[in-house]
């Protein structure tokens, strides 16, 4: 098993609809054909798994049906989108990439993307 460099943006601001997107790029030492991508959230020294997908190179990322994540891959880049975020979900989102095949197994962990989520202000009552 070997280590691998993973790059991701330092900061992302979620949209008013609670959607945040960022790119996770890994420095693959070879031509991986099976890759597993996991998004972890670190807050208050606790690490929890947000979502994960295993994909064959050239195919779409497939997250579980009830996942809050979607994504696409292009070469050594994965474009990740997390939806349904609220202010309480603000935190450090870490991209983890595992090259499962061919051997050897590689593991790469990014430094994390700080995602800021601001709940939208409720619309004021308006007179018609």
């Amino acid at each position: 098993c070997k280590a691998m460099h993973v790059a991701q943006p330092a900061v992302v601001l979620a949209s008013s609809r609670g959607i945040a997107s960022f790119v996770c790029e890994y420095a693959s030492p070879g031509k991986a054909t099976e890759v597993r991508v996991t998004v972890l959230r670190q807050a208050d020294s606790q690490v929890t798994e947000v979502c994960a997908a295993t994909y064959m190179m050239g195919n779409e990322l497939t997250f579980l049906d009830d996942s809050i994540c979607t994504g696409t891959s292009s070469g050594n880049q994965v474009n990740l989108t997390i939806q349904g975020l609220r202010a309480m979900d603000t935190g450090l989102y870490i991209c983890k990439v595992e090259l499962m095949y061919p051997p050897p197994y590689y593991l790469g962990i990014g430094n994390g993307t700080q995602i800021y989520v601001i709940d939208p202000e409720p619309c004021p009552d308006s007179d018609f």
Partner: nanobody
Framework: EVQLVESGGGLVQPGGSLRLSCAAS????????MGWYRQAPGKERELVAD???????NYANSVKGRFTISRDGAKNTVGLQMNSLRPDDTAVYSC?????????????WGQGTQVTVSS
């Protein structure tokens, strides 16, 4: 807690067949590479075969065409079908699982099962 429990070892004649099985407990089966290593007396441990969550397989040259690895997601087991066994296949066969848990790389091992090929 993750546990790997092997079964199916034993004594077999040259040219015979055996099937090893490894049952995995804990939430690793769908996320980890799983496979088999073996160690013969006085020799280094060597990879026999492994299989990824996506079903990609990898074999040692010495077992290609004779051994077949498979995984059963419904039972959380990994099997190793060993055909055309030879005396130099005699070893302790250990199941392993390799992957990561949150931010840490992990490798888990079973206790091992003895396979002896002898007439």
């Amino acid at each position: 807690e993750v546990q790997l429990v092997e079964s199916g070892g034993g004594l077999v004649q040259p040219g015979g067949s055996l099937r090893l099985s490894c049952a995995a407990s804990g939430n690793i089966f769908s996320r980890y590479i799983m496979g088999w290593y073996r160690q013969a007396p006085g020799k280094e441990r060597e990879l026999v075969a492994d299989i990824t969550p996506g079903g990609n397989t990898n074999y040692a040259n010495s077992v290609k065409g004779r051994f077949t690895i498979s995984r059963d997601g419904a039972k959380n087991t990994v099997g190793l079908q060993m055909n055309s066994l030879r005396p130099d296949d005699t070893a302790v066969y250990s199941c392993y699982a390799r992957g990561s848990d949150k931010l840490l790389m992990r490798t888990y091992w079973g206790q091992g099962t003895q396979v002896t090929v002898s007439s």
